[in-house]
């Protein structure tokens, strides 16, 4: 009696179970009474990453330098190429199909997490006692200067964008 279900790594066709092609190979002929499933290796710049019955291999992803992309990991017959972004840029999506310039943190904000090839800069507001007076993709919030440790006094209070201004203590004559 013809099977209605097949084992793992097999598929049902014409009332018989045929072997799937292994990763890195495509299907060129279903099995017959007289022959096993016939598979052929994927060509250069092609891949298939699963046991399959695909008649065409997938093209490796192209990391387009015009979109700021570069190859992070070269594809094989069993894996796709992995793209990442050039220095200073990051992917716009998980698939990394294009890149955008890393965001800078405005004055009053510092870098909480430096950007990577796949994630943008994460900024945070400088809390009380810290400041950032530049727009930067790298600078964290800096602590206000401690006037006391320099035997100075605060002449102008700091903000989230400016450091305190220290000055000499008023001496009693």
């Amino acid at each position: 009696e013809p099977p209605t279900a097949c084992r793992e790594k097999q598929y049902l066709i014409n009332s018989q179970c045929c072997s799937l092609c292994q990763p890195g190979q495509k299907l060129v002929s279903d099995c017959t009474e007289f022959t096993e499933t016939e598979c052929l290796p994927c060509g250069e710049s092609e891949f298939l990453d699963t046991w399959n019955r695909e008649t065409h291999c997938h093209q490796h992803k192209y990391c387009d330098p015009n979109l700021g992309l570069r190859v992070q990991q070269k594809g094989t017959s069993e894996t796709d190429t992995i793209c990442t972004c050039e220095e200073g840029w990051h992917c716009t999506s998980e698939a990394c199909e294009s890149c955008v310039l890393h965001r800078s943190c405005s004055p009053g904000f510092g870098v909480k997490q430096i950007a990577t090839g796949v994630s943008d800069t994460i900024c945070e507001p400088c809390p009380v006692g810290f400041f950032s007076n530049v727009s930067s993709a790298f600078e964290k919030c800096h602590p206000w200067t401690s006037c006391e440790t320099k035997d100075l006094v605060v002449q102008q209070a700091g903000t989230n964008k400016t450091d305190v201004v220290c000055g000499p203590q008023d001496r009693l004559r």
Epitope: S19, V28, S29, F34, T35, E36, L40
Partner: antibody, heavy 114, light 112 residues
Amino acid sequence: QVQLQESGPGLVKPSETLSLTCTVSGFSLPTSGVHWIRQPPGKGLEWIGVIWAGGDTNYNPSLKSRVTISKDNSKNQVFLKLSSVTAADTAVYYCLGHGHFDVWGQGTLVTVSS
Amino acid sequence: EIVLTQSPGTLSLSPGERATLSCRSSQSLVHSSGNTYLQWYQQKPGQAPRLLIYKVSNRFSGIPDRFSGSGSGTDFTLTISRLEPEDFAVYYCSQTTHVPWTFGQGTKVEIK
């Protein structure tokens, strides 16, 4: 029913290219492969190669540098070319549908001689 | 490539006798799927080969039951239980487990 018919010149000069055609009926070239097999007079059978449904090919490594198999789906024809032939290529050439091993063409004798 | 060696080269027998033909493979013909793609063909002068047995022991439709195939791995046998006059011919084993497909050199069964 499945039928295959080989045709081509019966005589080829040494160093020339042997060209044969296999015309098929009863099955579809876009969904089935076709094999070429040959048999020198009084000798055994030798698998030459196959063209698969999608146009991919496999060749016998011993002949790979000289063999080309192609096809024209619209004409139901498969073509065999064997270059730089010698007397050792004198044989009956058969075509065979993949999965139809019970049905062979009647074969065509090709003699390589000057 | 897989080499199939058939023996004997020639078998001289009388009608009604039993014929036992051997085919030995240089490596296993068992596919990873568990199937073994070993065929037997009969060929008469001036004719194309005729499929008798496929996958070691399956008789093709219309083939008389005096023909049977057996074996596994690398050793295979075609048996003709009682030779009929029309059985005198050349017999080839063939493997389609591995590309390139290969054939044995043939065993001629002739009338004694």
